[in-house]
């Protein structure tokens, strides 16, 4: 466990990792495969109309620890899972949307009367 105030940079992978990408493919991707020094991810989130949208792709090592931590964001239903154990490992990630809370209806951007 890291002590409070201590921060360690994530260890660089010894080699490039290939990930499946969908709705999140960078300009150098080929056949929906991207390359990274960090993590593969799959994310599910609600779009503006409340429909679930799944995206997947590559996260660079810089900042990926934070992005993969999946910190809850108020008024936003979103879940992300990350992996590094093998190429295209994110094909097997299936994050689910966190359950709706009652207060989401009250505090959300659209108020129902």
């Amino acid at each position: 466990k890291k002590e409070d105030g201590e921060s360690t940079a994530p260890t660089p992978r010894p080699k490039v990792l290939r990930c499946k990408c969908h709705h999140h493919c960078p300009e150098d991707s080929v056949n929906n495969i991207c390359s990274t020094d960090g993590y593969c991810f799959t994310m599910i989130e609600e779009d503006d109309s409340g429909l679930p949208v799944v995206t997947s792709g590559c996260l660079g090592l810089e900042g990926s620890d934070f992005q993969c931590r999946d910190t809850p964001i108020p008024h936003q239903r979103r879940s992300i899972e990350c992996c590094t154990e093998r190429n295209e490992c994110n094909k097997d990630l299936h994050p689910t949307l966190p359950p709706l809370k009652n207060r989401d209806f009250v505090d959300g951007p659209i108020h129902h009367r």
Partner: antibody
Framework: QVQLQQPGAELVMPGASVKLSCKAS????????MHWVKQRPGQGLEWIGD????????NYNHKFKGKATLTVDKSSSTAYMQLSSLTSEDSAVYYC??????????WGQGTTLTVSS | DIVMTQSPSSLAMSVGQKVTMSCKSS????????????LAWYQQKPGQSPKLLVY???TRESGVPDRFIGSGSGTDFTLTISSVQAEDLADYFC?????????FGGGTKLEIK
């Protein structure tokens, strides 16, 4: 030190198949990708494909799909490339090379493949 | 596929002279996410296998003499040998590793007068 050992030469009949080998030493095989590159006499270099020995994930140059098959034997730290339905166009020097980040930091000495009857 | 074009195809220089050779790619090799150019240079001496000189367009490989200098960005790259030596007699190849399939230039043959 890092070494990629390849046999010096192979002579094969047209229409046959051949399996070229590349024995890695001096590093952990699974920490690097292994690539294969073709060089015809007096010509440039052509990337055939690569394999990640840790999970045997492969990428191929579309020009070599169906021609080349890449495999690895982790127990002997050896990478292989099988070439099928050989013709005179396949006569070339074939190099194995390793990479962490898709540039090739160590190369084998190359195997000269001659396809002739 | 990304096409790599090298020029000149051959050149003859005297020991001590400055040598420059060019490599142009059919599309940019600059990755926006990390501002790195995905280009490498190799030296192939007669009867030998290629040897890595430079990667990420300008980073010299460990053990390579500092007379070898890589430069350029985007689509135009240069390998400079600041003071050519007799042992630099070789073919020089550039390679892009921005998008699969990785491709090489046709090479520049350096002869020593």
């Amino acid at each position: 030190q890092v070494q990629l050992q390849q046999p010096g030469a192979e002579l094969v009949m047209p229409g046959a198949s051949v399996k070229l080998s590349c024995k890695a030493s001096g590093y952990t095989l699974t920490n690097y990708w292994m690539h294969w590159v073709k060089q015809r006499p007096g010509q440039g270099l052509e990337w055939i494909g690569d394999i990640d020995p840790s999970d045997t994930y492969t990428n191929y140059n579309h020009k070599f799909k169906g021609k080349a098959t890449l495999t690895v034997d982790k127990s002997s730290s050896t990478a292989y490339m099988q070439l099928s339905s050989l013709t005179s166009e396949d006569s070339a020097v074939y190099y194995c090379a390793r990479s962490g980040w898709d540039y090739f930091d160590s190369w084998g000495q190359g195997t000269t493949l001659t396809v002739s009857s | 596929d990304i096409v790599m074009t090298q020029s000149p195809s051959s050149l003859a220089m005297s020991v001590g002279q400055k040598v420059t050779m060019s490599c142009k790619s059919s599309q940019s090799l600059l990755k926006s996410s990390n501002q790195k150019n995905y280009l490498a240079w190799y030296q192939q001496k007669p009867g030998q296998s290629p040897k890595l000189l430079v990667y990420f367009a300008s980073t010299r490989e460990s053990g390579v003499p500092d007379r070898f200098i890589g430069s350029g960005s985007g689509t135009d790259f240069t390998l400079t040998i600041s003071s050519v030596q007799a042992e630099d007699l070789a073919d020089y190849f550039c390679q892009q590793y921005y998008r699969i399939p990785w491709t090489f230039g046709g090479g520049t043959k350096l002869e020593i007068k």
